[in-house]
Structure formats: C-alpha cells, structure tokens
C-alpha cells in the first residue's frame, strides 16, 4: 500500500529541531511557527455536511493521524 503524504508537524519528526505540538514547521522561513499562522487543514465539525472547497487539500489515504490532529497528519520537520 502506498504511504500517504508526510507532514510537517510534530512528534516523529527527524532532528535537529522538531516543532512542539502547537507549532508547525514553515518551509519558507525554515523554523517552527504557531500553526495558526499557517493555513493548516481544519477538521470538519462532526456531522458537517457543507461541501469542501473545490481544491482543498486531501490525502488519498489515511496515515493514522493522532487524536485531535487536522485532516493531514503533520509531524513537524526540522
């Protein structure tokens, strides 16, 4: 089975500087920033029925996101 996309948040990131859980690694500035400063995928409320934006990001396969994480399981890199 093909593995889904890697992400840039969190726990199992390679060293040297993994982001803490509330931060995301911003490739453009090359350091961790508050995830709220980036357009991170937002989980839908339970029962939400409104259609997703026409080109919002979606993984083709789940890769086992941790509890409470957004639609993409983002482990923070660097």
């Amino acid at each position: 089975m093909r593995r889904g996309p890697r992400s840039l948040r969190g726990r199992d990131a390679p060293a040297p500087t993994p982001c803490v859980p509330a931060e995301c690694f911003d490739l453009l500035v090359r350091h961790c920033v508050a995830c709220g400063l980036l357009r991170t995928p937002r989980p839908k409320p339970a029962g939400a029925s409104s259609p997703a934006p026409r080109t919002a990001l979606q993984p083709q396969e789940s890769v086992g996101a941790g509890a409470g994480e957004a639609a993409l399981p983002l482990p923070g890199l660097l």
Epitope: P5, L8, T40, L57, L74
Partner: antibody, heavy 118, light 111 residues
C-alpha cells in the same frame, strides 16, 4: 470557503505603475501566504511574489526591482504594485494562496487582465 | 531557480484514451521526504485548478481518473480515461523553494 477577488484598472499606460488589489473572504490574511502570479496571453505562468502572515514579503528576482506587495489587514486585502510597466507586462494577474504543509496553491482568484498600452 | 520542463507540448487524444504527461525538474524538488510537485488544470478564461499536490495526492473533488507519480526530478500526471471535460492545459509547479516555478504546460486536445 476561501475566496479571492482581484480588482484594479484593466488598462495602464507604459512607464506608469500597475496597481491591483486582492480581496480575501473566508480566511484572514494574517494566516498563510498570499501570492501574485501572472500569465502572459497564451503563455506560461510566472510567479511574482508573496506577502506572509507576518507581513514579510518575497519577490521573484526577475521582477524584484519593480514590485511591491503590501497588505491592509483591516480590509483583509493585499495589493500588488508593478512600476515602470511596458507592453511585456500585459498579462492576466492572479492572486492565490497555498495550503499547508505542501504549499500547493489551492485557492485562486478568477484573474484580471491588465493591458499596457498608450 | 528550479526550471520545470513539460512534455509533450501538445497531446492529441480521443475521449476514453489514456493521457500521460511528463514534468522534469532541473534539480530535485524533494525535501523532508516530500515531493513538492503539484499539478494544475487550466481551461480557457479560467484560473488554474489544483489537481494533484505533493506529487501523488488528489485535491478535494478531483476524480480518481487523475493520478500523479514520481519523485526527485521526474514526475508524471496520468489521466486513465479522458472525459470530454479533461481537454485543457496542464501545468506542473514546484513548491520546494521560492521562486515557485511552473512548467509551460501540456495542452491535451481532442484528436
């Protein structure tokens, strides 16, 4: 749903400054990266630059000396200024925003054609 | 900057046929185990529409007939069976580093 809408003059005279504004709804420009891209008629897409959540900017080196991107957070708008325009700047100008973490531009304005002519 | 070269420039096919589009980067667009290569579809008078991100992941609402593959410098967009609405121009784009760059497109036209 995030929506972007470009606005500005469709005709600019040579040597003048092209000014466009992108109005964003459905998200705050204090989050993410907000970009300008242009497409010459029938040709490739050319990246112009961005303004970030912090207000920092990046300009494509090929246009850097003539480009300014700014923002008005109170109106949730960001703007493009391109100085000393020539006919070669005639293009469709798009504003767009990439999602995280893949920086793929999933939201685009509909584009606005700017013609440089006297 | 990273230069993206797309081939062929034009692909003439019939509905129902398979389309294979190529994008080659002047240097690797891989970073942190991710291929930062995206594919867009553009129809006349419209903005580009994101189809595939990170080389192989379909954006929301994109039909399963669209698939992407590749890593490093060589990437492919495949449309398994062309529908009438798929005739358009397709662009690849790298988001590994700024300036983000685009290929000059492959036009898929009706044969």
């Amino acid at each position: 749903q995030v929506q972007l809408q470009e606005s500005g003059p469709g005709l600019v005279k040579p040597s003048q400054t092209l000014s466009l504004t992108c109005t964003v709804s459905g998200d705050s420009i204090t989050s993410g990266y907000w970009n300008w891209i242009r497409q010459h008629p029938g040709k490739c897409l050319e990246y112009i630059g961005y303004i970030s959540y912090s207000g920092s900017t990046y300009y494509n080196p090929s246009l850097k000396s003539r480009v300014t991107i700014s923002r008005d957070t109170s109106k949730n708008q960001f703007s493009l200024k391109l100085s000393s325009v020539t006919a070669a700047d005639t293009a469709v100008y798009y504003c767009a925003s990439p999602n995280y973490p893949f920086y793929a531009m999933d939201y685009w304005g509909q584009g606005t054609l700017v013609t440089v002519s006297s | 900057e990273i230069v993206l070269t797309q081939s062929p420039a034009t692909l003439s096919l019939s509905p129902g046929e398979r389309a294979t589009l190529s994008c080659r980067a002047s240097e690797s667009v891989d970073n942190y185990g991710i291929s930062f290569l995206n594919w867009f579809q553009q129809k006349p008078g419209q903005a580009p529409r994101l189809l595939i991100y990170a080389a192989s992941n379909r954006a929301t609402g994109i039909p399963a007939r669209f698939s992407g593959s590749g890593s490093g410098t060589d990437f492919t967009l495949t449309i398994s069976s062309l529908e009438p609405e798929d005739f358009a121009v397709y662009y690849c784009q790298q988001s590994k580093e700024v300036p983000w760059t685009f290929g000059c497109g492959t036009k898929v036209e009706i044969k």
